[in-house]
Every structure is written in C-alpha cells, then in structure tokens.
C-alpha cells in the first residue's frame, strides 16, 4: 500500500549551528517516515499457463511490482536463474530480446510485464512439473527473482490450484541494499522518535565537527532482519531441463546485445498466431529475493551492481507509472 | 494526464459489424496494454480481449472468432472490430489500461453505448 | 470461464461505518484479484490490484485482502463519496472475469 506524507522544505542548518535536536535531526525524522510510508514492497508475479491447443506448449507471463525502472529480464527454466536454471530469454527494454530454444516467442506485455511461449515438440520441451523462474533487474530496488510450475497433474479440461510452495529467494546482497536502507532508516526513525520524547529540547550549540553520520550504518541491517528474510531456494529438480542448453548463458560483454534488434519485441501480429485459450495459470508466486543485479559471474551483460543503466527506449515514461508503482 | 478517448457508432443493425477506436493520450501504447470490456445490465460486465505493447493479442474464447483488436502506435490508436452483431450484443463497449499484465485496468474511456436494432 | 460470486448484490451501511465486501471465485485464483468502484453511468475505477495493492489516488481507507479462492474488500470508515457499486475480477486465467457487483447504500 502506498501513501503520501508531505515532507517540509529541507533548508541547510545555520552556519555554526548544531545540536542534538538541530535542523538536521529535526528535517531526519521527516524525511524517513516520508521513505518509510511510501516505499512500496517490490514483488514479481508469476503465471505458467498450458495452451489448450498446443499441450505441451506453455506460456509464461511475469511482471514487477515495483516502483523503479526494469532494465533487465531473464526468464530461465528448471530452477532460479544462477541456482541450475537455463536461460530461456533475456529481454532489454533497449537493446531487443534473445531466446533459446525451446523458447518461440519472448515479448513485452506492458513496460513491466513480459510473456514467453515455449516450443510443444522436441526433445527440448518442457513438461509440467517444469520450473519456471523470472528475474527483474530493476533500479533502485535491485533483482527479484520468483518462480512457478505446473502441477504434474495438469490437464486442460481441469484446473488445480498452484503449487503451494513457491520458491523463495533473499540474497544478502540486497538485504543490505536498498531495502536494509529502508529498514534501518524507519527502525532510526522510531529511535529518534523515542528519545525525542525522554529528552527536553537542548538549546543549539556551536558545531565542533562535520555533521554527517558514517554511511556504513545504512548499510547494516539487524541480524533479526536478516534472519527474517534470508531464504534459501527449494531447488526442484526435472527431468525435463535440456542439459544442451546450459552454454546458452549471455556471459559476453555489450557485445552481446549488438546482434539484437532494438524493439524487437514489438513486431505486431495478426490475432491468429495469438489466439490459443489457455487454461489457468498455476503457480502465481510471490518473490523475496532483493539481490543487488546479479551475482558475480551471472551479470547481464553490463558492469557494476546496477550502476550502469540503460535509457528506456519506449520513450518517456508516463508521469504517472503503472497503477501508480512507478 | 492519461486519457482514453472513444469514436464509434452509437446504432448498429443486426448482423453488422462494429468498429470502435479508442485514442488514448498521457502516455504510449509501447509500455501499456489496452483491453476491450463491455457491459450490459443481463450479462453484466465481459472482457473481451487485450493488445499487450508487443502487439500480440487475447482474446475471450467466447468473441474470438468474430473479434479482431489492433492497434496504430504511431497515432496512439486501438481498434476494436466486431462482426454479425446481434441483439444481445446491445452494451456499453469500454477500452481501458493495462498497467501491469495483471488484468487490473487503472485506466478507462468513457464507453461506447452501442445498441443492436433494426 | 472461472466464475466470480459476490454473494451480497447490496448493502446497506451508515457513513463512519466498517464495510466488508466479499467475493469468492470457483477456483484458487492465487491472488490475481482486482477490485473496482462504478459510479452510476460512470467507468469503473480501479482500486485495489494483486489482491492488497492499493491503486495511487485511491485513499487509504480501502483495503484488500484474502488468498485461494476467499477474497474482500474493507472500506474501514465509510464515506459519503464511497457509495458506489464494487466489482470484483480475476485475471488468474483467460477470459479474466469479474463479479456481478454489489452495490453500497447508505443507511
């Protein structure tokens, strides 16, 4: 849930002036209980669908639930991507999208959903206690990864409810991320707070040194708090994962992208090759993961831990994002 | 600010066509999909399909065969056709914003009553 | 088509009030619900998305909950703007489908 808090005008301190309840601490408290309300909790959703027509076809649709910008989308296959999973399709909002086999059709649906058919025949094929799993790289709040399946039982006449365990993933890294941040600021929050409330107001006093608090702090969650969100993955293992497409990873650099056409998802096409029913999504899942991009040796292809972004081509954004999350 | 704009014909005769545009302003189709739902008071409301900003379509099983949903990006525009209209067919006819790809329309046009009469 | 079911088509209530709206659907829909209001002779307006996530603009007295196949929406302090007709929908599978409204009366 979001709300707005109206935050007052930050102005600097006078020169020379600080003290325990100065500016500085009197502007703090506002501008993380301004954080604190309207941070939203990212998620990513999950739906694995089989088409009616086509049984051994399946199509799978994600989406981010979040406020930042995407700027990468991995679909993978027979685990979380980076935990034994295969790479099915890579989409960037910039610089197209890339797909393995037996992925037929990677597309985005909205500017922070994408959908992705797979194949029906082959030896590649998937079969229905096949894992899927989509991984949002998204700036500021990270990587989000969730995962979905069909039941073994899955038949198109019939509809079961999901999965009931999804897998969850917390890496560290994003624990001390943007969320830590968060966590931190609102538990500082209350603190101040609480003894603002013990403590008569001191007079202003000379300042003696620089006001600024060690970063490092921020960047330090509770043990509690890491405990809290630190799960490991429920790996499931399938006899269906392809072991041929495990060098179909994109570890190459920038260059990696140049082959692909810019929008390359955005060809339209007539309502026939669209218009199979599927039958219900199972497994809609709810993600934990906040990990910071990637892991070492899992980047997408572009440097540093979510600093190098790219431009979204779809123009500029709307001013309002989607259903307000942006 | 986002807007949905809506032209067609308020009168149709039975086992004609329909034909619907809906222009959209605030923002582009290349980051939204736009779906298709009409309302009757005896069938209440009905989805009828959706455009993703990829271009590729769905639709309710129950219109597909007569139902066809493109789109104009350049021009912000998404066409709504329908053909043998019926009497039942008789509904307000709305496009609306999809956000997400969850189905939830944060976004509407004011609707196109259309009634299926000779 | 998964069918959606809310089971009270009207309600009465006094402004101040807690107003709980329910809607069931035939299957577990896995929390891919939606929530609208519908003003007479207006759109639909969309409300509450993914079960509890509140639409921006929409105030924060509205609230969603539920899972599996048992869904509501709680309006916690009624107000006068608030009488409306409420739909529920699903976008778990295709055709998404909503409810056939229940429409919200002051006392």
């Known amino acids: 849930m979001r709300t707005e808090a109206q935050v007052p005008a930050l102005q600097p301190p006078e020169p020379g002036l600080e003290g325990a309840m100065g500016h500085r601490t009197l502007v703090l408290p506002w501008v993380l209980l301004t954080l604190c309300v309207t941070a939203g909790t990212p998620e990513v959703w999950v739906q694995v669908r089989m088409e009616a027509t086509e049984l051994s076809s399946f199509t799978i649709r994600c989406g981010f639930l979040g406020s930042g910008s995407i700027s990468l989308v991995t679909v993978s296959w027979g685990g979380p991507n980076g935990a034994g999973g295969t790479t099915l399709a890579v989409l960037h909002p910039e610089r197209g999208i890339r797909q393995w086999a037996p992925a037929r059709q990677a597309r985005w649906e909205t500017q922070s959903s994408i959908s992705l058919i797979l194949e029906g025949s082959g030896a590649s094929s998937p079969c229905a206690n096949t894992t899927f799993c989509c991984k949002f790289a998204s700036f500021p709040e990270g990587s989000w990864e969730a995962c979905g399946s069909l039941p073994p039982s899955s038949d198109p006449g019939l509809s079961a409810p999901p999965t009931p365990a999804p897998i969850l993933r917390a890496d560290l890294a994003g624990i001390l991320g943007v969320s830590g941040v968060l966590l931190f600021g609102c538990v500082y929050l209350l603190h101040l707070l609480r003894r603002h409330k013990h403590r008569p107001a001191p007079r202003l006093q000379p300042s003696r040194t620089s006001p600024q608090a060690p970063r490092a702090r921020a960047w330090a969650p509770s043990q509690a708090s890491q405990a809290a969100l630190h799960v490991p993955y429920a790996t499931i293992n399938t006899s269906c994962r392809p072991a041929t497409l495990d060098t179909a990873h994109p570890h190459g650099g920038p260059s990696w992208w140049a082959s692909l056409p810019t929008h390359a998802a955005h060809r339209p096409q007539g309502p026939a090759a669209w218009a199979s029913t599927p039958i219900p999504a199972r497994g809609s899942f709810v993600s934990v993961e906040n990990g910071l991009y990637a892991q070492a040796g899992e980047r997408p292809p572009h440097t540093g831990p979510g600093l190098t972004l790219f431009p979204d081509p779809r123009g500029p954004r709307a001013m309002e994002g989607p259903l307000g999350v942006r | 600010q986002v807007q949905l704009k809506q032209s067609g014909p308020g009168l149709v005769q039975p086992s004609q066509n329909l034909s619907i545009t809906c222009t959209v302003s605030?923002?582009?189709?290349?980051?939204?999909?736009i779906n298709w739902v009409r309302q009757s008071p005896g069938k209440g409301l009905e989805w009828l399909g959706v455009?993703?900003?990829?271009?590729?379509?769905e639709y309710n099983a129950a219109f597909r065969s007569r139902l066809s949903i493109s789109k104009d990006t350049s021009k912000s525009q998404v066409f709504l056709k329908m053909n043998s209209l019926q009497a039942d067919d008789t509904a307000i006819y709305s496009c609306?914003?999809?956000?997400?790809?969850?189905?939830?329309?944060?976004?509407w046009g004011p609707g196109t009553s259309v009634t299926v009469s000779s | 088509d998964l069918q959606m079911t809310q089971t009270t088509s009207s309600l009465s209530a006094s402004l101040g009030d807690r107003v709980t709206i329910s809607c069931r659907t035939s299957?577990?829909?896995?929390?891919?619900l939606n929530w609208y209001q519908q003003k007479p002779d207006g759109p639909l307006k969309l409300l509450i998305y993914?079960?509890?996530r509140l639409h921006s603009g929409v105030p924060s007295r509205f609230s969603g909950s539920g899972s599996g196949t048992d869904y509501s929406l709680t309006i916690s302090n009624l107000e006068q703007e608030d009488i409306a007709t409420y739909f529920c929908?699903?976008?778990?599978?295709?055709?998404?489908?909503f409810g056939g409204g229940t429409k919200l009366e002051i006392k």
């Open positions: 609306a914003r999809d956000s997400t790809g969850l189905y939830a329309m944060d976004y």
């Open positions: 605030g923002f582009s189709l290349t980051g939204y999909g």
């Open positions: 455009i993703w900003s990829g271009g590729n379509t």
């Open positions: 299957q577990d829909i896995s929390n891919f």
């Open positions: 993914y079960t509890s």
């Open positions: 929908q699903q976008g778990y599978m295709l055709p998404p489908t």
